[in-house]
Interface confidence: low
Amino acid sequence: EKLPKAPVITTPLETVDALVEEVATFMCAVESYPQPEISWTRNKILIKLFDTRYSIRENGQLLTILSVEDSDDGIYCCIANNGVGGAVESCGALQVKMKPKITRPPINVKIIEGLKAVLPCTTMGNPKPSVSWIKGDNALRENSRIAVLESGSLRIHNVQKEDAGQYRCVAKNSLGTAYSKLVKLEVEVFARILRAPESHNVTFGSFVTLRCTAIGIPVPTISWIENGNAVSSGSIQESVKDRVIDSRLQLFITKPGLYTCIATNKHGEKFSTAKAAATVSIAEWSKSQKDSQGYCAQYRGEVCDAVLAKDALVFFNTSYRDPEDAQELLIHTAWNELKAVSPLCRPAAEALLCNHLFQECSPGVVPTPMPICREYCLAVKELFCAKEWQAMEGKAHRGLYRSGMHLLPVPECSKLPSMHRDPTACTRLPYLDYKKENITTFPSITSSRPSADIPNLPASTSSFAVSPAYSMT
């Protein structure tokens, strides 16, 4: 009969290296009599016999982990006890060897130029993987701006446009290499104007091209503003190449203005904007008429048809390529500006503008335009349209127009001939369908000029003669 014998572990446990999802086995060979009871612990916690992840065989001497997980690493011990003497224990470590695995891969990033970008790349693996980065097809070199952090993440300080591109992280250890998917680092750049539009001083009716070039990422959009409002006329062409947008605004100039090019691009929910402005001013209408050549012809337009005398000859200025069209376009532009003026001012202003743009013409060897008499001009300015005139001059002072009344082609009253000096040298305005009683209700106006400048016309004319040729429409 055998003698009882205390357990002896003849094959101590060794360190076991195992790959994830592979099988790992610890052997705990025991000699004893009677047969010992063998139990297993992991990190001092008893492994339950019914845990299906494990297989215990050979009377408990073989412990097999059927599919190793990275969480299985630790210290495994076998304890043998048969009641004879004390229990014996042998321990060994399970080192879960793991091919590199990227647990938090990088993601596409949009970052504004100059800020800091971090592309994550958290890895697992045993041995611990080393992490490197590839940009495009080349290994990324670290420098003062670019560093791979201990965590594996890529940090780029002061992001530059050239940092944009496709990146992937590479995790490598002795068991293998893992690559992340390609991710895109997009460097967004605030909209910036590379080429601002140039200011122009042109004659009425000429074409001007304003050009504005802007850069940004994403490519900016360019819009044009005319005197604070969206451009109402003109042709806009634009093209995009290499993140640069080039916009050309082509204008037919009938009035001066401040044109602003606005380049805008979007960064997430925010927008960046860059602006550049140019002025387009018109060489003075009165100057363009000085020493001008022209011809006398019947007025065939529409705008002034009700204002000008029927079949009257008016002067057309041949300094314009198409005088009749040009002058009609100018009066049409002016007419639109008059929509907002008072009912008292409007007919007076219409008559003044029409007779100024389409001056009575004396045919002869040299066709000669006859300007409006100064007194009538002053009456419109200081009586009928005093408020409007002041408002318009206010706009000029604020710098929107180069000088004076350039928004409307109004004459400079002081430069016009007086009807008192030579009644035949100037044109009277047979206009204003107002009766004498309306005139007498004018508010008192404090004139900025001596009252002697205000026309002193016969009382029977209600200050102005009513022409049968003029009718309000």
Epitope: F207, S239, K241, D242, D246, R248
Partner: antibody, heavy 121, light 107 residues
Framework: EVQLVESGGGLVKPGGSLRLSCAAS????????MHWVRQAPGKGLEWVSS????????YYADSVKGRFTISRDNAKNSLYLQMNSLRAEDTAVYYC??????????????WGQGTLVTVSS | DIQMTQSPSSLSASVGDRVTITCRAS??????LNWYQQKPGKAPKLLIY???NLQSGVPSRFSGSGSGTDFTLTISSLQPEDFATYYC?????????FGQGTKLEIK
């Protein structure tokens, strides 16, 4: 490949009319300004007319204003020039040209082979 | 309209010569200036755009310079295929005026 093919030229009497066509292919016609340029026999190039991509703006040389009309049909990728009240001095080879506007001043980067218009009694 | 004046109107030169053609605008046109080459019976061909930019596919012996009103087309070393008529064109205004042309002939 960008291709512009003019047609519609021929002999016409003074005062008569003619309609030129230009068929475009190989590019997105509807996004380009297009032009007509002519060249009288033995003479230099003379720009005739232009039309913006969506027909909003049309321009004409002084010599043809009021007589010629430019138009386009983007659905058909076609450019047209309707010529009325033709004169002997309108005799020329008429070219259609594409206006390439890309980061720089416009330029006519593609031309058709031209179609000859002869105005003679 | 903007007038474009080319000089000379004709020019005789030999293969290998350096040739310069000038173009003057009647008003400042910034760099809105293009150069074209035309051979008999053919459509014009764009050489230079924006005063100094070489059109794709054009040999580098062609170059352009200038800004404002005065512009120059230079052929650094004439080749047999360069004998043709050259036109400048302004694209600053929608009249797109051409110069009268410079005919380059073999000496």
């Amino acid at each position: 490949e960008v291709q512009l093919v003019e047609s519609g030229g021929g002999l016409v009497k003074p005062g008569g009319s003619l309609r030129l066509s230009c068929a475009a292919s190989g590019f997105t016609f509807s996004t380009y300004t297009m032009h007509w340029v002519r060249q009288a026999p033995g003479k230099g190039l003379e720009w005739v007319s232009s039309i913006s991509s969506r027909s909003a703006y049309k321009y004409y040389a002084d010599s043809v204003k009021g007589r010629f009309t430019i138009s386009r049909d983007n659905a058909k990728n076609s450019l047209y020039l309707q010529m009325n009240s033709l004169r002997a001095e309108d005799t020329a080879v008429y070219y259609c040209a594409r206006d390439f506007f890309q980061l720089g001043p416009p330029r006519f980067d593609s031309w058709g082979q031209g179609t000859l218009v002869t105005v003679s009694s | 309209d903007i007038q474009m004046t080319q000089s000379p109107s004709s020019l005789s030169a030999s293969v290998g010569d350096r040739v310069t053609i000038t173009c003057r605008a009647s008003q400042r046109i910034s760099s809105f200036l293009n150069w074209y080459q035309q051979k008999p019976g053919k459509a014009p061909k764009l050489l230079i755009y924006g005063a100094s930019n070489l059109q794709s596919g054009v040999p580098s012996r062609f170059s352009g310079s200038g800004s404002g009103t005065d512009f120059t087309l230079t052929i650094s070393s004439l080749q047999p295929e360069d004998f043709a008529t050259y036109y400048c064109q302004q694209s600053y205004s929608p009249s797109y005026t051409f110069g009268q042309g410079t005919k380059l002939e073999i000496k």
